[in-house]
């Protein structure tokens, strides 16, 4: 476990790994006596005091409300539960429990736009009005739309060609169809 925001409570990762390798799996080196291996605390609990001697129990306590540990550990305090960020439109998928962190996600028809590994914004998937879906909206990717004739793609939405200004990129997409198609009025653009 990487204790986020719990500095100074456990040895640095390198030291810890070196010392832990002296003990069998599921045990750790006593904080004050290198020759003693104590049993780690179960997930959902944290370390209150080291085992007094080999074969004696480590004293562990269950994580308080709003905190958790997701695996065996010898943390001196549990980790704070994540709060789903309302300002990023996140919703809680599953609440925090003593042995697992909160799971945050997005509502249906939304995708996750990542700011960092732990922060994302929930954004509405483009519905492709006036177009067809080429690639459906996925967990981290907006819908890719293909616009109907008379519409062009702007910011993932199909916009009428009447909104296309001269010299803009959309002029190419909004050109009237070749003469051969003139007989088919529903195909003609509005530019």
């Amino acid at each position: 476990i990487h204790p986020s925001g719990v500095t100074g409570l456990v040895p640095s990762l390198g030291d810890r790994e070196k010392r832990d390798s002296l003990c069998p799996q599921g045990k750790y080196v006593h904080s004050k006596n290198n020759s003693i291996c104590c049993t780690k605390c179960h997930k959902g609990t944290y370390l209150v005091s080291d085992c007094p001697s080999p074969g004696r129990d480590t004293v562990c306590r269950e994580c308080e409300k709003g905190t958790f540990t997701a695996s065996q550990n010898y943390l001196r305090q549990c980790l704070s539960c994540k709060t789903c960020r309302k300002e990023m439109s996140q919703v809680e998928i599953s609440p925090c429990q003593a042995d697992k962190d909160t799971v945050c996600g997005c509502k249906e028809n939304q995708f996750q736009r990542y700011l960092s590994e732990t922060h994302f914004q929930c954004v509405d998937c483009s519905p492709c009005f006036n177009g067809t879906v080429t690639i459906p909206c996925k967990e981290t990717q907006n819908t890719v739309c293909n616009c109907h004739a008379g519409f062009f793609l702007r910011e993932s939405e199909c916009v009428p060609c009447s909104h296309c200004k001269k010299n803009e990129e959309c002029m190419k997409l909004c050109l009237p169809p070749p003469l051969a198609n003139v007989t088919n009025p529903q195909d003609s653009g509005t530019a």
Partner: antibody, heavy 113, light 111 residues
């Protein structure tokens, strides 16, 4: 630790081509939108190009449209910028930047035309 | 294209002072769908790459000291540095991500 490392910059003649690469590590590259941003010597920042996480959405700055191509390889954690028909005004430090909010930045690679 | 006008272009400050940098956009950056302003602020120190300070006009990025504050809505935005420190001497840029092409302000040099 998040790292973005650009490469491929150098001295090139006007009208020639160059491809820049950006290698990402320390984060789930395939989840992130990516951008290229440049900075001419002693000048401000200029956005160059954007590519969405799955490459479905691509946009360019007016100054490079039709000459530059942004692409990515999510399997290899790589971002690319293919630059064709280079002009003297393309001389700049080129940065790749990760996330829609440009939260992660590389140290840049210098392109001199 | 949205034009971003930043002011002042440079500013001489002393440690402990309060600093305000302005950024104006040629059109509103307020997204009606989510009621957020798509305006970011960046800090760039000499010889370094830029660093995200503020997004959504007022949300501080992880690890950014609380002396940095973003405010404003629509077309007028401000970056305030309360009690400026020597390590804050840098160039500051605003960026709109409301619509493509994205555009930066010309920058403000804090010296």
């Amino acid at each position: 630790e998040v790292q973005l490392v650009e490469s491929g910059g150098g001295l090139v003649q006007t009208g020639k081509s160059l491809e820049l690469s950006c290698e990402a590590s320390g984060f789930t590259f395939s989840n992130y939108d990516m951008n290229w941003v440049r900075q001419a010597p002693g000048k401000g920042l200029e956005w160059v190009a954007y590519i969405s996480s799955g490459s479905g959405h691509i946009y360019y700055g007016d100054a490079v449209k039709g000459r530059f191509t942004i692409s990515r390889d999510n399997a290899k954690n790589l971002l690319f910028l293919q630059m064709n028909n280079l002009k003297s005004e393309d001389t700049a430090m080129y940065y790749c930047s990760g996330s829609y909010w440009f939260a992660y930045w590389g140290q840049g690679t210098l392109v001199t035309v | 294209d949205i034009v971003m006008s930043q002011s002042p272009s440079s500013l001489a400050v002393s440690a402990g002072e309060k600093v305000t940098i302005g950024c104006k956009s040629s059109q509103s950056l307020l997204n009606n769908k989510d009621q957020k302003n798509y305006l970011n602020w960046y800090q760039q120190k000499p010889g370094q790459s830029p660093k995200l300070l503020i997004f959504f006009a007022s949300t501080r990025h992880i690890g950014v000291p609380d002396r940095f504050m973003g405010s404003g809505s629509g077309t007028d935005f401000t970056l305030t540095i309360n009690s400026v420190q020597n390590e804050d001497l840098a160039d500051y840029y605003c960026l709109q991500t409301y619509s493509f092409p994205y555009t930066f302000g010309a920058g403000t040099k804090l010296e």
